[in-house]
Amino acid sequence: MMTGTIETTGNISAEKGGSIILQCHLSSTTAQVTQVNWEQQDQLLAICNADLGWHISPSFKDRVAPGPGLGLTLQSLTVNDTGEYFCIYHTYPDGTYTGRIFLEVLESSVAEHGARFQIP
């Protein structure tokens, strides 16, 4: 039975040209995290494997940095980066947990972070 929940940074706004940290946290489970995948819609951005460490997809190597922790840092943001980002926790024995963050990249300087919220 899957008892865990994923807390994410929720809705995030950031300025064009800036950087942002995407973070998820898995709680309320004793399951072992074997791998975390970060995806943008249907594109794989990065993998953090418990044994093998980080792998960044070649097409994102220039703008994506691993960490902090199991999070992901996106740099040199463009308006085209607006959209959904998913953290997919592969765990044993629970299975897969998915968290979601919506990133809004703004032209202006009014960007500010959204509140943290629970993924149902």
């Epitope: 929720g10 819609q41 959904e84 979601r100």
Partner: nanobody, 125 residues
Framework: QVQLVESGGGLVQAGGSLRLSCAAS????????MGWFRQAPGKEREVVAA????????YYKDSVKGRFTMSRDNAKSTVYLQMNSLKPDDTARYYC??????????????????WGQGTQVTVSS
């Protein structure tokens, strides 16, 4: 309980157009993120288009970009999918989905709370 009712499907020749509508029963529709999905026989359900509550951000599946347009009318609690230059590959049952208190758009079916019964779109060659 939110009721979603799709309409506008039918049989059309390749290159033709259809406009799908999805009417919601809920008055708080303006806070819903909405999506259009489709499922062809023997295939998995896939997202076609998705829209945030304000209508500012819209996602399109790559294969429909430039051909399909999703829009919403919050005053009428309705979303639309204008489908132009239809292809036989577009043949499927099209479903409308709603997520209450949406943040941005949602492209994965597991994040939606309510679904319509679907409307069939058949494109003949």
């Amino acid at each position: 309980q939110v009721q979603l009712v799709e309409s506008g499907g039918g049989l059309v020749q390749a290159g033709g157009s259809l406009r799908l509508s999805c009417a919601a029963s809920e008055r708080t529709f303006s806070s819903f993120a909405m999506g259009w999905f489709r499922q062809a026989p023997g295939k998995e359900r896939e997202v076609v288009a998705a829209i945030d509550p304000s209508g500012r951000y819209i996602y399109y599946k790559d294969s429909v970009k430039g051909r399909f347009t999703m829009s919403r009318d919050n005053a009428k609690s309705t979303v639309y999918l204008q489908m132009n230059s239809l292809k036989p590959d577009d043949t499927a049952r099209y479903y409308c989905a709603a997520r209450i208190r949406g943040e941005g758009y949602y492209t994965r079916s597991s994040f939606y709370h309510y679904w319509g019964q679907g409307t069939q779109v058949t494109v003949s060659s």
